[in-house]
Interface confidence: low
């Protein structure tokens, strides 16, 4: 099992849409799959797939996941607020027929806030 | 309540081959959430996973490396019940076995050796 | 292959006292596949303690588990004459599905 997740960074403008994705591969067949996904180390969502369904469509505040056989898992954040900056990481366990787990690279998500003066203000902010 | 009943010899002899088998009372072998599984112990190799058969529709195994080449764990669904085989022991083989049922919980990924036999001691000698 | 290295080998502590028994694993794991378990003389381990920090049926609150990514922790927070036994670590994500090598937990 490998978990491949991207992009490693992204940095999007409050109350746009962010996507990230995650690619799910597994060499044998399985029958259920459970995937899950974390913000700064805080678990947002934790469903599961069987027979080509997500349990769950929703994934943390505006969060929404969707899943595209046979690999492709995307969580879509939209709209963005300031709060969603963070690392995320993607999670998957094979269930059935066979226990075994795989954890994607962080994907680093910067919010720039809508107000210019406020984004000049915390780009200055960073040290170096 | 799940309840394993083990039974077999207690002394085998080396090169030949240790047979154990685990019957099942609360649940069935066939179970679609349940993996049935053995483990040993001994004072020199501590608690030692060996394999694991299961069913998802069909019939899998899962076998540790360290003895993947010597055992071989059999479902018979007739007897409700499953079996270690492990062939050419040494006395290295010499341990308490224990037959152990873990499941897959639908409200997490958690899985977990919730049920265990009360072990037998398998010793190798001539 | 993941290992789990348990300290300290032996806890010499008295009823009522609090024990915190750790457990390292050679690589990082998920949280989701650690499990303690307790062991008597002469009886099979018992589940304590599954995805790092959930009780199993019946195991009385004193006994609690956390810890993430390379270290876990289990701890009892009022030792009570029962509880001197041996303790075990086990990884379950996949296999092999190793365990520590155990904490005594022995009356001072």
């Known amino acids: 099992l490998s978990v491949q997740q991207g992009p490693n960074l992204l940095q999007v403008r409050q109350g746009s849409q962010a996507t990230l994705v995650c690619q799910v591969d597994q060499a044998t067949a399985w029958e259920r799959l459970r995937v899950k996904w974390t913000k700064d180390g805080a678990i947002l969502c934790q469903p599961y797939i069987t027979n080509g369904s997500l349990s769950l469509g929703v994934c943390g505040p505006q969060g929404r996941l969707s899943w595209q056989a046979p690999s492709h898992l995307t969580l879509q954040l939209d709209p963005v607020s300031l709060n969603h900056s963070g690392a995320y990481v993607c999670w998957a366990a094979v269930e059935i027929p066979e226990l075994e787990e795989a954890e994607g690279n962080i994907t680093r998500l910067f919010v720039d806030p809508d107000d210019p003066t406020q984004n000049r203000n915390r780009i200055a902010s960073f040290p170096g | 309540q799940v309840q394993l009943q083990q039974s077999g010899p207690g002394l085998v002899k080396p090169s030949q081959t240790l047979s154990l088998t685990c019957a099942i009372s609360?649940?069935?072998?066939?179970?679609?959430?349940?993996?049935w599984n053995w483990i040993r112990q001994s004072p020199s190799r501590g608690l030692e996973w060996l394999g694991r058969?299961?069913?998802?529709?069909?019939?899998?195994?899962d076998y540790a490396v360290s003895v993947k080449s010597r055992i071989t764990i059999n479902p018979d669904t007739s007897k409700n019940q499953f079996s270690l085989q492990m062939n050419s022991v040494t006395p290295e083989d010499t341990a308490i076995y224990y037959c152990?049922?873990?499941?897959?919980?639908?409200?997490?990924?958690?899985?977990?050796?919730?049920?265990w036999g009360k072990g037998t001691l398998v010793t190798v000698s001539s | 292959e993941i290992v789990l290295t348990q300290s300290p080998g032996t806890l010499s502590l008295s009823p009522g006292e609090r024990a915190t028994l750790s457990c390292r694993a050679s690589?990082?794991?998920?949280?989701?596949?650690l499990a303690w378990y307790q062991q008597k003389p002469g009886q099979a381990p018992r589940l304590l303690i599954y995805?790092?920090?959930s009780r199993a049926t019946g195991i009385p609150d004193r006994f609690s588990g956390s810890g993430s990514g390379t270290d876990f922790t289990l701890t009892i927070s009022r030792l009570e004459p029962e509880d001197f036994a041996v303790y075990f670590c086990?990884?379950?994500?996949?296999?092999?599905?190793?365990f520590g090598q155990g904490t005594k937990v022995e009356i001072k």
């Open positions: 995805g790092a920090s």
């Open positions: 690589q990082s794991v998920s949280s989701s596949y």
């Open positions: 152990a049922s873990d499941v897959v919980l639908e409200s997490s990924s958690s899985r977990h050796f919730d049920y």
């Open positions: 058969t299961y069913y998802r529709s069909k019939w899998y195994n």
């Open positions: 086990q990884h379950y994500g996949g296999s092999p599905r190793p």
């Open positions: 609360g649940d069935s072998v066939s179970s679609n959430s349940a993996a």
